[in-house]
Amino acid sequence: HSFGPGPGLGTPRSPCNARGPCRLFFRVCLKPGVSQEATESLCALGAALSTSVPVYTEHPGESAAALPLPDGLVRVPFRDAWPGTFSLVIETWREQLGEHAGGPAWNLLARVVGRRRLAAGGPWARDVQRTGTWELHFSYRARCEPPAVGAACARLCRSRSAPSRCGPGLRPCTPFPDECEAPSVCRPGCSPEHGYCEEPDECRCLEGWTGPLCTVPVSTSSCLNSRVPGPASTGCLLPGPGPCDGNPCANGGSCSETSGSFECACPRGFYGLRCEVSGVTCADGPCFNGGLCVGGEDPDSAYVCHCPPGFQGSNCEKRVDRCSLQPCQNGGLCLDLGHALRCRCRAGFAGPRCEHDLDDCAGRACANGGTCVEGGGSRRCSCALGFGGRDCRERADPCASRPCAHGGRCYAHFSGLVCACAPGYMGVRCEFAVRPDGADAVPAAPRGLRQADPQRFLAGVIAVIVVVVIAIVAGIVVLVISRKKRMAKYEKAEIKEMGEMHRELNA
């Protein structure tokens, strides 16, 4: 049993990060076997933290391969029956000791998760899990607390409405105080610590114990058959059946005698006292969230999980917040639906990640009658009189640019501006000079032009202005219609997409 850098992972790391002494704690969490996201749901079957943790102090050049681990067992009490299939989560926490602002610092070094099958009362199961550069070797087993017995820790207590109602000779049942303890069904004298029964008058032994009442440790039990124990660690003195007779090791394990007992050297993929426990295979479905299990078609080979988008971890048990990677461009809103990622795009952008900058003014709203103008790979708003700013939302002073020529006075008006011209000038912007003899009116610039008939000239100017205005209005109408069509198209698509999102979120 160890926790340290895995093989071939470079220079062994210290868990203390060269910051003085630290301690390792292990948090064990058990969840029902069907738990979807093993790190996100509650430890419904129970949880426990290791105690009696030795302090680890890093010394220069010292290998971190063998770290001092917590002494003894981590016991995880569980309620009710033992499910047999469960999710085992083991977290390795580091407590940095010494002077730190705010007291000791805690860090999660590693978390391993796996789906397991295990009958209560069985032998220790061994396992090795790797996460990142760390490797954890551990063993686990499930044991029933009396009066629960059997592979599923079935209760042997009879239901009663209250402890006070328990019949003669019966006590309240533990750990189920609302029930009464049933009369003993095991063989009289059967060890309550090392034996259990599933049928009346039987005494089955837990791993490591033997004898009719499960009171004899396995280390001396092989001498019961016409042998007597010899001095310490010399085995048995009289001939008789040996502990390896009949090969108690299953699945091709090889047996060797040790201290009057036996030890099985198990082939890869098997473990347990008699190599009776096999490893998890892909057929067991160890990968959460639909992950693809690769390898592990037999217990000799370790499995690897290939996770769907949005999940990670050795068993695809951790959900990734994919929106934290900000996949939606151009200010799009990110929605992680679990099985899919959706981007709700701002006006003017489209595509699964809002990556397409719409190639016209369809998504660009220019306020207050402004028109959208393209050019040079960008778009801008050409604002109506009296408005300015990027989207024509700001009120502008039409007189700020001094539009009235030749000293004309500017007056702001709700529909634009009016120029009061100085004597000798006329026109919308006072741009025409009036001859003193009243013969003709000439545009102030260019000065070379002269008109014989001022009336005809003015009519021509007005006609030109009218044509230009009509052209501008027609252009605006065309732009508005095309923009409305495009907006309707994208709104329709967006409404459909939002409906999809709503359905998917509800699902």
């Epitope: 069907v34 057929a283 969230n289 699902a507």
Partner: antibody, heavy 117, light 107 residues
């Protein structure tokens, strides 16, 4: 050995109903997402729908083309997933496969559904 | 839905030759592309996952490459049992979608 065996296919008139079954063996069925994928004659593969685990409240997802007409359910105690097909159309004619997981790793041999008048 | 376009539709080759099949996605799918093989009268079989990883039990002559929108399945030296229809599938965005298939036939 992992095996998925589909059944329940046959000839049905447009507007009719059919229920397909897929029985799994060799896997811990309750730990696997299950999908239905179909293949029209001479055509490519089309995902039909998916059912997830008990821990996901048996969440289901469907292709747009079958939404509201097809229903997927599962019975973990029987290692079986079902596809209930209602209001069948001629374009639903295909071989229907059940597959596992998100990546369709294990496949059944398929069952043929023919919708014709 | 993401559209996958496979080319060519048919590939006529002799045993021992190298086969190169193409799959183009309508948008970025990262490396979430799988390749499936389907022989006449049989169900599809997963060959490659994650664009370039061989699935359990798949011979080394099959290899996949690509990321983003362009993906390739290569069969380095065609064996008689490799003549079949090959489909690419994307698993980046739900729902999963498949290409139209490429038929590898004996010349």
């Amino acid at each position: 050995e992992v095996q998925l065996v589909e059944s329940g296919g046959g000839l049905v008139k447009p507007g009719g109903s059919l229920r397909l079954s897929c029985v799994a063996s060799g896997i811990t069925f309750s730990n696997f997402w299950m999908n239905w994928v179909r293949q029209a004659p001479g055509k490519g593969l089309e995902w039909v729908g998916q059912i997830r685990l008990k821990s996901d409240d048996y969440a289901t997802h469907y292709a747009e083309s079958v939404k509201g007409r097809f229903t997927i359910s599962r019975e973990d105690s029987k290692n079986t997933v079902y596809l209930q097909m209602n209001s069948l159309k001629t374009e639903d004619t295909a071989v229907y496969y059940c597959t596992t997981g998100y990546y369709f790793d294990y496949w059944g041999q398929g069952t043929t559904v023919t919708v014709s008048s | 839905n993401i559209v996958l376009t496979q080319s060519p539709a048919t590939l006529s080759l002799s045993p021992g030759e190298r086969a190169t099949l193409s799959c183009k996605a309508s948008e970025n799918v990262g490396t979430y592309v799988s390749w499936f093989q389907q022989k006449p009268g049989q169900s599809p079989r997963l060959l490659i996952y994650g664009a370039s990883n061989r699935y359990t039990g798949i011979p080394a002559r099959f290899s996949g490459s690509g990321s983003g929108t362009d993906f390739t399945l290569t069969i380095s030296s065609l064996e008689p049992e490799d003549f079949a229809v090959y489909y690419c599938g994307q698993f980046y965005s739900f729902p999963s979608t498949f290409g139209g298939g490429t038929k590898v036939e004996i010349k």
